[in-house]
Structures are given as C-alpha cells and as structure tokens.
C-alpha cells in the first residue's frame, strides 16, 4: 500500500478511507504543484489508470466517482499532466478499504479443559468483515460484580488464576470495528460445570480366538474426575453409519469394553467423555482402526497400538499389517486409510 508518500497536494475520500462495502465513493485529488498548471489530472487504482466517471471540478481539483465500491482494499493515487513534462507528476496517494460492520458473535461457549489452567471461550464471528475487527470478551463475577475485559481475535484463553474470587460468571463478547459494534448474548458460567475431562485415548484392541470371537477395546484417561460418562462409537471402514455404546467410566484403571463384531472386517473406534450430568463433551478421540480376525480363527494379524494423541491433534490412523515381514507396505497403508482432518467437537466425522 501507499503508506508514506510525499504529496504535492491532497487526496481525500468521501465518506472516508474505510467505508461500508457497496457504498458509492467519491475520491478527490487537489494539486499544489509549483510551476505547473496541469492540463489533466489522472486517477490510478492499484496502478491502473482509470478512464470513467472523472470530473474536473476546477483548475486544481478533480473527482472520481465509484458506484457500489466492493473491493476490500485498493491503492489510489493521482497524477498531473504538466506542460513541458514528459512524465506525469505524482500528486498524492491513499489506501482505501471497504468492509462490513461485525455480526453479533454467536454460539459463545466457554470450557475448562482439565489440567489446562485456562477457561477457553470460543464463538462464531459471522460473515467476514474485511477490515480489522476486534473482540472484547467481558467476564463479570456474579458474586463480586468485578468485571474483567480481554481483547481477542477469534477466541480467548483466560487463566483460571484470574477467576479465583468467584465460581459464577457472566460472559459476553463485543465485536468492534470502525463501522460498528455488536454484542453476543450473555452466557452464564459456573466454573464447576464447564470442566471437560482430560483426553480419552484408545490404547489397543484385541480379538479373542473363541468360538464366538469378541473384540476388547482398551481405553484410558488421566482425568481426576470421579464420575465420567462416555460414548464409544464404532463402524466398519466401509460403512457410513456409526453404532454408539454408552459407559459410566472410572478411570482409576484402564477401561475394557467388549464388542461382538463382524469377522474379517476393519473397524474404526472413537471415544468421548463428559463429566456425568454436565453438557460439555470432549471432542471425539482420534480414530483407532482394528481388524477383526477371520472366521476360521487364524490370527494372521497384529494389532498395532495408537501413540498418545493430544486432544487437538488430527486423525491418526491405525493399521494391521498382513505380515510382520512387510513394514513398507504397512507404512503405505497407514498413510492412506485416513486423511487427517481437524477434530471439531461433536461434528468430527470419519469415513
């Protein structure tokens, strides 16, 4: 853009250098050149000479008019054609921007991920504004009436150390830019009700070699929360539909869940938990893939366990190699079963 330019005159914009997208805009150029009575004044947008809607107001001033200006940014400058000069002479330049006032932030959610030491608040920002937009997060104690404010761009992490004086808060978000301000709805937060247990991990799975083979899935969490309610969803990799099993979990020991599954099929498992009776779920765990054994009961497969996966990581595939002598093939399989895509709470889907 044109940040610092030595002007030999002035350039100004009506209604202003930042305006609402779709507005009609007039840009004025006034020369103050020494030893020049310009024959013509020219306007350039992003380096290209403009041909239309230019009016010469008087000897020193011209105007260009744009109907429904809809570009987020443009670099304008104007020049003079001075008699006896081969080149045009620069008069002045301006950066101009158009955008929208912000939408009211919606779907405000605040959670505390266990052990994080922060309350994380997120919201939907609405349609793009195209101009600098800030979000002011207000956190007001319902017990002490003290209010804190935090500046954010799309989410905020507030240290729980600064939320020591109270358990109940009112949280809301203001979206601010030079074209306007909008408030979210207020969210009532009780710190004890928004804790999400530490990530749940499926560590391994095995299929027994019984007459009716059963698959045992082992899963764990480092949570200190005593009463935890969990869901495990599972499906074959070829299926679109998930089956869901529910569990009350006690993570003082590794959880074992039993499934009677189709033989010789590749299954995907994911687990998520919440504190019993609360509303905030963990995101689904990374998908764990397990191959059930053939009906004959021959165990020509090797379960391969998941590494530790952080809550926000992308999908990690689990594969079972046909033979332990084919490591290269195994690696290729692991790279092609799943494309990693970001976890997004309840909406993460596989397959």
């Amino acid at each position: 853009g044109i940040t610092s330019i030595n002007c030999s005159g002035d350039m100004w914009v009506e209604p202003g250098e930042i305006f609402q997208m779709g507005m009609n805009v007039s840009i004025y150029c006034q020369e103050a050149l020494k030893h020049c009575r310009p024959r013509n004044l020219y306007f350039y947008k992003n380096g290209f000479k403009e041909e239309f809607d230019i009016t010469r107001i008087n000897r020193t001033t011209a105007r260009i008019w744009y109907k429904g200006f809809s570009e987020p940014h443009a670099y304008m400058h104007c020049t003079a054609e001075c008699p006896g000069h081969f080149q045009e002479t620069l008069i002045c330049g301006k950066d101009i921007s158009s955008g929208h006032p912000p939408d009211a932030p919606s779907n405000l959610t605040c959670v505390i991920y266990e052990y994080s030491g922060n309350m994380t608040c997120t919201w939907n920002t609405g349609k793009p504004t195209y101009i600098d937009t800030k979000y002011i997060v207000h956190v007001k104690s319902l017990e002490t009436e003290e209010e804190q404010q935090y500046l954010a761009s799309s989410y905020v992490k507030i240290s729980t150390d600064s939320l020591q004086g109270s358990r109940k808060y009112l949280v809301w978000v203001q979206a601010v830019n030079s074209l306007g301000m909008e408030n979210s709805q207020q969210l009532h937060v009780h710190l004890d009700d928004i804790v999400i247990p530490s990530a749940s991990i499926i560590s391994r799975a095995e299929t027994t070699n019984d007459t009716v083979p059963k698959t045992i899935v082992y899963w764990k969490s480092k949570t200190m929360i005593e009463k935890v309610f969990c869901e495990m969803r599972y499906k074959t990799t070829t299926n679109q539909t998930w089956s869901v099993k529910e569990f009350d979990a006690n993570f003082t020991y590794v959880q074992q869940s039993e499934f009677y599954l189709e033989p010789d099929s590749k299954y995907v498992f994911q687990v998520r938990c919440q504190e019993t009776g609360k509303r905030n779920w963990q995101p689904w765990s990374s998908p764990f893939v397990h191959q059930t054994s053939q009906e004959t009961g021959k165990r020509n497969w090797q379960p391969w366990s998941s590494p530790f996966v952080h809550q926000t990581s992308q999908t990690v595939s689990q594969v079972t190699a046909k033979s332990s002598h084919e490591p290269q093939k195994m690696e290729m399989l692991s790279a092609t079963i799943f494309r990693g895509h970001p976890a997004s709470g309840n909406h993460q889907d596989i397959g």
């Epitope: 930042i18 101009i131 800030k134 804190q148 404010q149 935090y150 500046l151 954010a152 030079s178």
Partner: nanobody, 116 residues
Framework: QVQLQESGGGSVQAGGSLRLSCAAS????????MGWYRQAPGKERDLVSM???????FYADSVKGRFTFSQENAKNTVYLQMNSLKPEDTAMYYC??????????WGQGTQVTVSS
C-alpha cells in the same frame, strides 16, 4: 507492565468541550490497542472509542461526530476530544491498554460531569 494516567476531566455545561489525555509509561505500550471507556454509576464500563489496527477508529454511536480520538506516539499519549457534551456523557472516563489474549489494563480514571 504498562501504567496509564488520565487527566483533563472536570465539570462543564451542556454544549461545552473537554479534552482528556492519557499518558502511558512502560515498555509494552507499543503492543497496546488503546481505547477510551466510560462507566456511569451502576452501569457497565462501556467502550467509547478504540484505535483499530488498520489505522481506523471505532466510535460508539452515542458519541459519533462529537468525540475525536487522537494519539501522539512521541509522547506515548492518547487524547479524547469531546465536543457538544451532553448530560448523558457524565461518567468516569478510563483509558485502556488491550493486548491480544491479555486482561485489559486501565488507568485510574477521570471524572466528567456535564450539567444542563
């Protein structure tokens, strides 16, 4: 840590003018998004004006066309020129330094009283 000190408040008749100043000290001032806020008795602390990162300025609807935010970088000082003051502009005025993800830091405030 930034310290902020407001001045320039006072009592004025409706239609009058005041110019508030806010002097900042501390080495993190350059990362501040500076704003002016006001709090009337029993009300929330509301944003009046804020300098945006793209060089533009936000003004609350209630002060548009009457208040002007300016800054003097060499002096680490921001100003709020308040013209055509109304009784409803009566409040404690604060300047604030906001940095992304951090708690907004306020000055002590300066009282503005507009009588009719």
């Amino acid at each position: 840590q930034v310290q902020l000190q407001e001045s320039g408040g006072g009592s004025v008749q409706a239609g009058g003018s005041l110019r508030l100043s806010c002097a900042a000290s501390g080495d993190t001032y350059s990362s501040c998004t500076m704003g002016w806020y006001r709090q009337a008795p029993g009300k929330e602390r509301d944003l009046v004006s804020m300098l945006m990162g793209d060089g533009s300025t936000f003004y609350a609807d209630s002060v548009k066309g009457r208040f002007t935010f300016s800054q003097e970088n060499a002096k680490n000082t921001v100003y709020l020129q308040m013209n055509s003051l109304k009784p409803e502009d009566t409040a404690m005025y604060y300047c604030g330094c906001a940095t992304l993800g951090s708690r907004t830091i306020w000055g002590q405030g300066t009282q503005v009283t507009v009588s009719s």
